[in-house]
């Protein structure tokens, strides 16, 4: 025999109390997904949180940060501040990127130089605490009567999809 | 206890530069944010810019050419400048600590009038 | 920028009396409110932030409420204590902005 409740939609949850017909979500909750039993309490943004998406009867809230803090963990599980750019968040707050590490956001930790040398090339701009040395040809590209090379394409910003 | 300490001037010539510090105790520089807000004589607040615990900085756009927030984290202070003064400049001048909880001022120093006149 | 209109701008209130103060903002701000108590020659003070979140040893007779585009802050038996100037603020993106006020005058 067919659970009535399967028929409930995303939205809608099986009512025991009411002979198993489907009631709409009561306001502040959701259901993602059909035959459920009740509905799930939508998050709330509150604090240093803020709504990047409205809960609706389908789907939970979404939540970012409020300026100066930006989101860390699964869904933006929590806030921290924001550091410059050049520096990382430790324990005893944001602290200058070492030598020969860098970090061109407010957020995360800081990386090490690209290595050029591993790839054969040359260091043409060399690294700061706030951007990765830029690799240009191989040294033997640059000897005497080696043909002219074409210069590198502009780097992008990480996380900038292209125009 | 949490406090903050403006210090300022009193009074300035127009087109000059207003300088004031901010100095705290009760907390440090190293895990707070400050912001500045300004209050003109018998008028509402206006937030003016912060600088975030790892010295990075937000403006109010309305203002954002003419002012620079620097902090010492050492001496426990702030420093607020605006430079290029008119008389509409004329203000209480605070500055307020940003909590962990949200982007709000929840300690706020006692102000330093700021008169700009010639 | 986001405006923040606050009504009334004054009111005349007892001790004892029931006040609501309602901010409306220019668009969505969530939750992200704080409220603001004033006294004359003396710097703000933090009464309320995330729109009902009341801040440490604010008094419980202040209440916030409201998402979205309109908040209230309740005072729920006007002390002689109270009578301030009251501010909203939103925080949901910058510039950070402020209502005019709302001065709460004895009757």
């Known amino acids: 025999l067919q659970d009535p409740c399967s028929n409930c939609p995303a939205g809608t949850f099986c009512d025991n109390n009411r002979n198993q017909i489907c009631s709409p979500c009561p306001p502040n909750s959701f259901s993602s997904a059909g035959g459920q039993r009740t509905c799930d309490i939508c998050r709330q943004c509150k604090g240093v949180f803020r709504t990047r998406k409205e809960c609706s009867s389908t789907s939970n809230a979404e939540c970012d940060c409020t300026p100066g803090f930006h989101c860390l963990g699964a869904g933006c599980s929590m806030c921290e501040q924001d550091c410059k750019q050049g520096q990382e968040l430790t324990k005893k707050g944001c602290k200058d990127c070492c030598f020969g590490t860098f970090n061109d956001q407010k957020r995360g930790i800081c990386r090490p130089w690209t290595n050029c040398s591993l790839d054969g090339k040359s260091v043409l701009v060399n690294g700061t605490k706030e951007r990765d040395v830029v690799c240009g040809p191989s040294p033997a590209d640059l000897s005497p009567g080696a043909s002219s090379v074409t210069p590198p394409a502009p780097a992008r910003e990480p996380g900038h999809s292209p125009q | 206890q949490v406090q903050l300490q403006e210090s300022g001037p009193g009074l300035v010539k127009p087109s000059e530069t207003l300088s004031i510090t901010c100095t705290v105790s009760?907390?440090?520089?190293?895990?707070?944010?400050v912001h500045w807000v300004r209050q003109p004589p018998g008028k509402g607040l206006e937030w003016l810019g912060v600088?975030?615990?790892?010295?990075?900085?937000d403006y109010n756009p309305s203002l954002k050419s003419r002012v620079t927030i620097s902090k010492d984290n050492s001496k426990n202070q702030v420093s607020f400048k605006l430079s290029s003064l008119t008389a509409a400049d004329t203000a209480i001048y605070y500055c307020a600590r940003n909590p962990l909880t949200a982007t709000v001022m929840d300690y706020w120093g006692q102000g330093t009038l700021v008169t700009v006149s010639s | 920028d986001i405006q923040m209109t606050q009504s009334p701008s004054s009111l005349s209130a007892s001790v004892g009396d029931r006040v609501t103060i309602t901010c409306r903002a220019s668009q969505n701000v969530g939750t992200n409110v704080a409220w603001y108590q004033q006294k004359p020659g003396k710097a703000p003070k933090a009464l309320i932030y995330s729109a009902s979140y009341r801040d440490s040893g604010v008094p419980s007779r202040f209440s916030g409420s409201g998402s979205g585009t309109d908040f209230t802050l309740t005072i729920s038996s006007l002390q002689p204590e109270d009578f301030a100037t009251y501010y909203c603020?939103?925080?949901?993106?910058?510039?950070?902005?402020f209502g005019g006020g709302t001065k709460v005058e004895i009757k």
């Open positions: 009760g907390f440090s520089l190293i895990s707070y944010g």
């Open positions: 600088i975030w615990s790892g010295g990075s900085t």
């Open positions: 603020q939103q925080y949901n993106s910058y510039p950070l902005t």
